[in-house]
């Protein structure tokens, strides 16, 4: 079975939301829904694994109720008709409250692991390769939804590639209903390694700076800083790092480092006070020559929420802020899977980091 | 390296209070969820309480349920068991325990990583 | 709740014996399934999970299977440092989402 690398995520769509799974649903497939249950308005919410965006063929409909005690139903639609239900009679999400929703996608069936404990399984009632797009409906606000493919080394790219001049990554922040598939940068022949999602939230209506209801705020802090983690099997082609967070209102800057041992081989350094996105590398405490062009104006804003993707290829990074290119950095220190260490520090908060 | 530690056991009386600490080392606690699980006199495991730190989520035993109250900061990457109106049967050895759900493109439906244990005892 | 009734609740068995400790879950759990060594004094360790995966840097001499509802933890030659108390462990969201068997005590014959 041929697999790319992972599609990008879906960040802060809004709801009802429809979305393109690239490939469709694949054997080994991690599917990530994270958001925050509304409190104010509506008994239900959905997720549902369909064929198109009509809604007739629906091949896994997870709908939570909050109704006689709660509960969650699963089913099936079948050209505009639902077969029997199956019911969970223990509602693992609360109203008002941020929820982690994975789906994995195996051959038999899917598995649904709901804030880090497994839910329900669903065995398939049609073949699960027909799917082909992901839909989200019902009082639920929406944080990201996110792919990650299995570790398999790919025969051929699954989806067809988009030149890297035309916007990239992740899609705009969704006005409409339906979502297109995203630009997204040339899949990689690679293998796709682990992918380890670190995600607190102190506050997730703020996680974009155009929230659906008012920010909420929760008993547990944002991530500690300076953060600092572990990037598992280091760089390599293809390999994604994804932040997200906000900009402190009186922020002077802030820096994303990428290192290898003692070295930085990578420093993003946005500097609100020279207006600039400063990139640069330090080998044995010796900095090399700044790169700051950029094309277009300075995309972090103070007090604004903003998500960077960070992608490995063979010859450079390629980054990208709240879904648009931004710039290349060709690498300076090239032993790839030496560079396994993310430090982020300076004037921001934190709200989601996927190594 | 991933490591677990407990604190904050000791005697009480019935009745009484005691905050456990589970401090992590080694992984972020808002990347997995933690447990407490207690562990009687001669007696086997008893599964008390988990927290899923990034939603806040929270879950407990029957047995504990209105009593006991588990949180995290994750800022002090430190897991917490706030024990009220304490029993005589909540005597037990406390381990908090790490729930990895993905490693290494696998799950993992375990506990993988467990503290040393803090003992409370209640009796008067 | 999901009960997890693991059975022997104890038995004796010599070094190099093959020994099969079965749980058996109330209800389906998937394969939200782990088993754990403990030996007095000590927290319990990782042996199985899901089901069926060997935990890194546990002996292969350790496994475990799955039929429907039943799990069994197999030892296919007891080791000296075997000898302790395994515990079964399911983790389907429940009422309870974590439910431990009540343990077996393997003894030295």
């Known amino acids: 079975m041929a697999f790319s690398g992972s599609q990008a995520p879906y960040l802060s769509p809004a709801v009802p939301f429809s979305g393109t799974i690239q490939g469709g649903l694949q054997d080994g497939l991690q599917i990530t829904v994270n958001g925050t249950v509304l409190s104010s308005s509506g008994t239900r919410f959905a997720v549902n694994f369909q064929t198109g965006f009509s809604g007739n063929d629906i091949a896994f409909h997870f709908n939570p109720r909050f109704e006689d005690g709660g509960y969650v139903v699963c089913n099936t639609r079948q050209n505009g008709s639902w077969g029997p239900e199956e019911r969970k009679t223990h509602m693992p999400f609360q109203k008002g409250m941020p929820f982690d929703l994975c789906f994995l996608v195996q051959s038999s069936d899917f598995k649904v692991m709901v804030n880090g404990i497994l839910f329900v399984q669903y065995f398939h009632r049609v073949p699960f390769h027909r799917v082909d797009t992901i839909s989200v409906n019902g009082s639920v606000q929406l944080s990201y939804i996110s792919f990650q493919n299995p570790r398999t080394v790919p025969v051929q790219p699954a989806f067809s590639t988009v030149p890297f001049s035309q916007p990239v990554c992740f899609p705009p922040r969704p006005r409409g209903r339906r979502q297109k598939p995203p630009g997204v940068w040339p899949a990689n022949p690679a293998p796709i390694t682990q992918t380890v999602i670190h995600t607190v939230q102190s506050a997730p209506g703020q996680m974009f700076s155009t929230p659906a209801i008012p920010p909420m705020m929760y008993p547990h802090p944002a991530y500690p800083m300076p953060f600092i983690t572990t990037i598992l099997g280091g760089l390599y082609p293809s390999k994604s790092i994804l932040l997200s967070g906000t900009v402190l209102p009186s922020a002077q800057r802030f820096h994303i480092n990428l290192c290898s041992g003692n070295h930085i081989a990578f420093h993003l350094n946005p500097r609100f006070d020279e207006n600039a996105v400063v990139r640069n590398t330090q080998i044995d405490n010796s900095w090399g020559s700044e790169e700051r062009s950029l094309p277009r104006k300075m995309p972090f804003v103070r007090g604004q929420s903003f998500s960077v993707w960070i992608l490995c290829e063979a010859h450079c990074l390629k980054v990208a802020v709240d879904g648009q290119h931004l710039f290349e950095y060709y690498h300076r220190l090239r032993n790839l899977p030496t560079i396994n260490r993310l430090e982020v520090g300076g004037d921001i908060q934190l709200t989601h980091v996927q190594t | 390296e991933v490591q677990l530690v407990e604190s904050g056991g000791g005697l009480v009386q019935p009745g009484g209070s005691l905050r456990l600490s589970c401090a992590a080392s080694g992984f972020t606690v808002s990347s997995s969820s933690i447990h407490w699980v207690r562990q009687a006199p001669g007696k086997g495991l008893e599964w008390v309480a988990y927290i899923y730190p990034y939603s806040g989520y929270t879950s407990y035993a029957d047995s504990v349920k209105g009593r006991f109250t588990i949180s995290a900061d994750t800022s002090k990457n430190t897991a917490y068991l706030q024990m009220n109106s304490l029993r005589a049967e909540d005597t037990a050895v406390y381990y908090c325990?790490?729930?990895?759900?993905?490693?290494?493109?696998?799950?993992?439906?375990?506990?993988?990583?467990w503290g040393q244990g803090t003992l409370v005892t209640v009796s008067s | 709740d999901i009960q997890m009734t693991q059975s022997p609740s104890s038995l004796s068995a010599s070094v190099g014996d093959r020994v099969t400790i079965t749980c058996r879950a109330s209800q389906s759990v998937s394969s939200a399934v782990a088993w754990y060594q403990q030996k007095p004094g000590k927290a319990p360790k990782l042996l199985i999970y899901s089901a069926s995966s060997l935990y890194s840097g546990v002996p292969s001499r350790f496994s475990g299977s799955r039929s429907g509802t039943d799990f069994t933890l197999t030892i296919s030659s007891l080791q000296p440092e075997d000898f302790a108390t395994y515990y079964c462990q399911q983790s389907y969201y429940d009422s309870n989402p974590i439910t431990f068997g009540q343990g077996t005590k393997v003894e030295i014959k």
């Open positions: 325990a790490r729930y990895s759900t993905y490693s290494s493109s696998k799950w993992v439906w375990g506990m993988d990583y």
